[in-house]
Interface confidence: medium
Amino acid sequence: TALSPTPTTMTFTPAPLEETTTRPEFCKWPCECPQSPPRCPLGVSLITDGCECCKICAQQLGDNCTEAAICDPHRGLYCDYSGDRPRYAIGVCAQVVGVGCVLDGVRYTNGESFQPNCRYNCTCIDGTVGCTPLCLSPRPPRLWCRQPRHVRVPGQCCEQWVCDDDARRPRQTALLDTRAFAASGAVEQRYENCIAYTSPWSPCSTTCGLGISTRISNVNARCWPEQESRLCNLRPCDVDIQLHIKAGKKCLAVYQPEEATNFTLAGCVSTRTYRPKYCGVCTDNRCCIPYKSKTISVDFQCPEGPGFSRQVLWINACFCNLSCRNPNDIFADLESYPDFEEIAN
């Protein structure tokens, strides 16, 4: 077997791992690197090899991988040594699958929804349990109620609001009280003095094909900063968008395929079809990035086991400008694009 023809300085043809052979040595010490890093095809990450020596083009899905020639982490790939474990010599790049979760000693499969108690509905997503409250308490019965209490009602799961000063008339401080309840989050049961914060979404981890975008938000019941993620696909890898640029033009800002198709993820298929817009390309040095977009929820159905939902970037419009660097560089640091924040969530 050999590595795929992806441009890389680390090609090798290992002998079969038989009794007579010694294990191939993939890392050389001290490091020996070419003077200039390889040029990677669009969408292939330029990364440091597993020896922490040289820049290489990351191995892609189905490619052989070793301790040196590592799989593309920005594509959610890992080196599957299942055919060679525990030798850890040569594996094959495979897609990270959604993993199950364990909560209070009970194991749940990826995408499985369950109720650990009557107050929460939870879903297992890629090893993490996310829960939504089923007891969405309405606001206290009176906005002017100064001392509302949350009390447990016998025979009912969710607590109810009661107001000890029901007989009182509304006072001049009604507006103040309303603001206090908004801040303390009677509806969401948020903590007092919680200043809501949501960062912009990071750029997509790949310039083409399926990637991941993340942001930090504390808009949750505990007011804790948590990382949210969504899938993103700025443009397909298998379409030469340049062919769609109109004569006399240098850019195609938005590319939209003719037909609607299903999204696929880890062998699972979206329950409905979509006709997404993608960012296009330019023939000069400009690059095209989203500037109007939103996040949609896509339901996936798996051939075996339960389905699941994923947040997905939905592009409405793209902008082509000159503030681009080598597209492979955004994989390394995932800095935000300058000057542009997405207009919508």
């Epitope: 799989c71 982490p73 890992y78 525990p86 495979a94 699958v97 959604g98």
Partner: antibody, heavy 113, light 107 residues
Framework: EVQLVQSGAEVKKPGASVKVSCKAS????????INWVRQATGQGPEWLGW????????GNAQNFQGRVFMTWDTSKDTAYMEMSSLRSDDTAVYYC??????WGQGTLVTVSS | DIVMTQTPSSLSASVGDRVTITCRAS??????LNWYQQKPGKAPKLLIY???SLQSGVPSRFSGSRSGTDFTLTITNVQPEDFATYYC?????????FGQGTKVEIK
Amino acid sequence: EVQLVQSGAEVKKPGASVKVSCKASGYTFTSYDINWVRQATGQGPEWLGWLNPGSGKTGNAQNFQGRVFMTWDTSKDTAYMEMSSLRSDDTAVYYCARNLDYWGQGTLVTVSS
Amino acid sequence: DIVMTQTPSSLSASVGDRVTITCRASQSISSYLNWYQQKPGKAPKLLIYAASSLQSGVPSRFSGSRSGTDFTLTITNVQPEDFATYYCLQAYDFPITFGQGTKVEIK
């Protein structure tokens, strides 16, 4: 720099369970196996099992089948090893190791009534 | 299970000596053998993998070799920091198994 940082020492009673965590940094967590190994005082190391956070698969040594439960949380780049029905001879230092090259600092688990 | 027989169980050496530790596998393990160094209260540290490949950052006075199912770790010009316990590990098949260890002490 590849680092595996394990949770602190634990003292447990016989029959109880213990859960040791192993936080990985300096590499892509889903790209490598985590192996669990234990070592009793004055003894050689003993392999417990492996897990792969990328594929979601695990494998245990035969003698620990049903007693060692390996899990992980990709959002925290952390692997966990839970051992149930503890006996006094489970007293040992428990290590996690990335593939078989980089090792955590170890977690001492003492089982005593 | 593959049994790894490590000899000797302990040895004494002086700084500057040459030390040899041997591991024998109960069946063929090709070259899938690692050597580790362990100091008291510390985790094992990988020295040699695949029988003879030196792990990054490990001094070149450590070397490994293979002859069939016999594997040798050699430390030439032993230094004060080399006094520790050494283990071999077979990574050919599950379950992964270790040798019983060799304690290298100062003479």
